[in-house]
Each structure stands twice: as C-alpha cells, then as structure tokens.
C-alpha cells in the first residue's frame, strides 16, 4: 500500500529520488570499471514522517511503535522500492565485457 | 551478496531481527483485531556499519558515497529482507473473519 | 530485437521547430543514454548531446545549446529531440544512438531521420 | 575540443589486400588501465553508422575478426586484413574522452 504523498514538513524534505554525481573513484569501482567514468547516481533520500510512503503493514507497524518508544524503535527508512538497470563496461581477464545490473539504481522509493 | 555479519560497533549493535511486545493499542487495531491480543512484533534495528549485511549493490553504493558525503547521503539503513506471515482474527460487518498478513512481521535482515 | 526506431523524414518551413522521435525497443531504456549526432548531406558525423532516461539529465555540444532540447518519454520508452528556430544549416540526417554511458561507444543506432528545411 | 584527423581520406584497394587507415588525436585519449576512449565506425552508403571497435582494440559483437584496432595516447589504427567487397564504406574514428564527442572526418574505402 502506497500511502500519503503530501510531505508534512515542507518540499524536499521527505523520502524521495536523489540524484548524486559520482566518478568510479568514489564508488571504489575504478578498478574495474571502465565505463561510465562517471554515473548519475539515483538513491532513496529523506525523513519518513507517520505514513508517509508507507511500503506496507510492517512500515505502518514501525511507525506506530516509533511514536511510542523512539528509544527503542527507529521510524521507518526511505529505501528503494524498485531499481532500474545499468549496464557498465568492466575489464576482464581477457579483455573487456558488458555487464547488467538490476539492483544498481533506484527508480523509485518508499518508507519502511 | 550477504556481505559480512560480523558487527564492528560490538555485539548486538549492528542490523538484527529484534522483538517488541506490542499492544492492540500501542499498534491502533483495538477497534478492528479482535486477536492476538498481544503480538510480539518481529523488526529490524541496528546499525548498517561499512558493508555489513550488504543487500545488493545499491547498498554498497550507498556506504561508499556515505563516507564521502555523509551530510549529503545517509548511511545504508537496516530493514526486512524477508517476510513471516501472521494471522489475524478481525472484526467484519458480518461478524469476524481469520485474515493472513504476509507482509507485517519481519523475518530476517539486510542494509540497504 | 535490440532497435531504436527513427521516423524517415521531416519536412518543416524555415523558422520553425520540429521534435523528432526515437523509440527504443529489445532492450531496458533506462539503463542506457540515448545521444543524438547530426550529418549533413555528404559530410562527416557531429554529436549533439545525450539524455540519461534514468535521470533526464542531458548535456548538450556548446554548438547545439539553445538549438536542441532533448527529452524523453520513459513510460513509451521514447527519446526525442526538438529543434528550434530551423534555418537550411539545419537540414541533415539526425541519429539517435544508445551507450552505456556519456562516455561509451554508441553500439545501436536508429536508421536516422532526414531533416529538410525549406520553404 | 578534441581534434582527430584521419588519414588517407580516401584509399582504394583490390579485395583481399590489406589495409591500414590512421586516426591523429590532438591529445592523449589513454585512461588509467591502458585502455583508450577511441572507437571506430563503419557507414555504408545510405546507411547508419555501425560500432566495429570500442575502447580502441575491443571488437563489436558480431564484427568479423579481419578488423583490428590498434594504438595508443594520440595515435591509433584500423587495419582491415584482407578486404571484402562489402567492406565499401566510410570509416570514422571517434573520441570519447572529454565531451563534447568528436569524430574524425572519415576514410572512404573504395573496392578496385
């Protein structure tokens, strides 16, 4: 269940897509990563007030037992509900390859 | 990948399944549960320490680019990786009927 | 298969704008950039920019800024490229061509679309 | 911007001969792993360009093995090893190093 998309503390500030710019230096990947030298990296970024983008029952759960026992219970977390793929070239024993990945990139977020 | 369980910060202190006992009341289904009237309320709390319960490559992102800018992505966050089912006896217009939750109580967990 | 469809020509006054297509089909759209490169009648080939899908990021040669504004359509899986204020230079085959990123080579490209502008 | 010229513009052989075509960038184009951002293109009349050799000696798939990509930093070269009728083409090289791409001017291969 997909609920409310209405942030309540102002624009931006709820879990949502980000887009970071990273070389494969900061990613640790320029070992073996020859191509893209740089990748626009999407990720699931911001605070999950009560209901907000709730991925499901669990989400609501955590929610409810947070507002009771914030101690003890963290709000739920702004992660990717899908990814999109990414191919990247990488070097190989014997030259190089194409590889695709599916849990690269996400496309999309919720709280849970 | 399942990258490694071994928690730097010390035992316990790193991503896990926990219990909570919860409520009817604590969780908001006193007006539509009828039982459990108590649920030991299975979560995922901890800490997401460089690579430890890695989900996939988006969570091994996420620690690089987190270490680099850690003001502007947050750390990987601990969350289910799977799910247990639970039954519910609700109240219904009719009367009252058994329901099963697949997606309410957490079963294992991963960083991402 | 692995194909980017391109319609065949377009024929469009002086002035005047055009936004020409290019489907991708065979493959995940957003795990490619789409780049689109220009050649006129008997020349070489000019690139004019890219478009991440997954982002909508774009970046444009310095020659093509303010002449070319690209977009995409993910939901049909279609890029396009709009162009502005067309005069005779403009007048050529556009391809649309994927890669793995800005800096890749283009391993499928579209059949072109031909562009004449005349009045 | 980066310049490549290529040389000769145009050349005509007897199929079956061999064939070196050159590609001069105005600057280096070598990566850290000894790998070049230069690849080279095939274009039959009337139709689009086709990807022969990425990442200056890697052949496309399904590109006959008599084409080979050589060279390195500024100087690089498609050699055609023994020429086929259906090789009548323009051939370009183009850099991807910095942007904005660029592409040489072309070789037009011209069967006797």
């Known amino acids: 269940a997909r609920n409310g998309d209405h942030c309540p503390l102002g624009p931006g500030r709820c879990c949502r897509l980000h887009t970071v710019r990273a070389s494969l230096e900061d990613l640790g990947w320029a070992d073996w990563v020859l191509s893209p030298r740089e990748v626009q990296v999407t990720m699931c970024i911001g605070a999950c007030p009560s209901q907000f983008r709730a991925a499901n029952m669990h989400a609501q759960i955590k929610t409810s037992l947070h507002r009771l026992k914030p101690d003890t219970v963290p709000a739920p977390c702004c992660v990717p509900a899908s990814y999109n793929p990414m191919v990247l070239i990488q070097k190989t024993d014997t030259g190089v390859s194409l590889q695709t990945y599916d849990d690269l990139l996400a496309k999309d977020c919720h709280c849970i | 990948a399942r990258n490694g369980d071994h928690c730097p910060l010390g035992p316990g202190r790193c991503c896990r399944l926990h219990t909570v006992r919860a409520s009817l009341e604590d969780l908001g289904w006193a007006d539509w549960v009828l039982s459990p009237r108590e649920v030991q309320v299975t979560m995922c709390i901890g800490a997401c320490p460089s690579q430890f319960r890695a989900a996939n490559m988006h969570a091994q992102i996420k620690t690089s680019l987190h270490r680099l800018k850690p003001d502007t992505v947050p750390a990987p966050c601990c969350v289910p990786a799977s799910y247990n089912p639970m039954v519910l006896i609700q109240k219904t217009d009719t009367g009252v009927s058994l329901q099963t939750y697949d997606d309410l109580l957490a079963k294992d967990c991963h960083c991402i | 298969q692995v194909q980017l469809q391109q319609p065949g020509a377009e024929l469009v006054k002086p002035g005047a704008s055009v936004k020409m297509s290019c489907k991708a089909s065979g493959y995940p759209f957003e795990g490619w950039y789409i780049h689109w490169v220009k050649q006129r009648p008997g020349q070489g080939l000019e690139?004019?920019?890219?478009?991440?899908?997954?982002?909508?990021?774009?970046n444009h040669a310095q020659k093509f800024q303010g002449k070319a504004t690209l977009t995409v359509d993910t939901s049909s899986s279609t890029a396009y490229m709009q162009l502005s204020s067309l005069t005779s230079e403009d007048s050529a085959v556009y391809y649309c061509?994927?890669?793995?990123?800005?800096?890749?080579?283009?391993?499928?490209w579209g059949q072109g679309t031909t562009l004449t502008v005349s009045s | 911007d980066i310049v490549l010229t290529q040389s000769p513009s145009s050349l005509s052989v007897s199929a079956g001969e061999k064939v070196t075509m050159s590609c001069r960038s105005s600057q280096s184009l070598l990566w850290k792993h000894g790998y070049n951002y230069l690849d080279w293109y095939q274009q039959k009349p009337g139709q689009p360009p086709k990807l022969l050799i990425y990442l200056d000696r890697n052949r496309a798939h399904g590109v006959p093995d008599r084409f080979t990509g050589s060279g390195s930093g500024t100087d690089f070269t498609l050699t055609i090893s023994s020429v086929q009728a259906e090789d009548l083409a323009v051939y370009y090289c183009m850099q991807s190093f910095e942007t904005p791409i660029t592409f040489g001017g072309g070789t037009k291969l011209e069967i006797k």
């Open positions: 690139w004019m920019g890219w478009n991440n899908p997954r982002t909508g990021l774009t």
């Open positions: 061509a994927r890669g793995v990123g800005a800096d890749a080579a283009f391993d499928i």
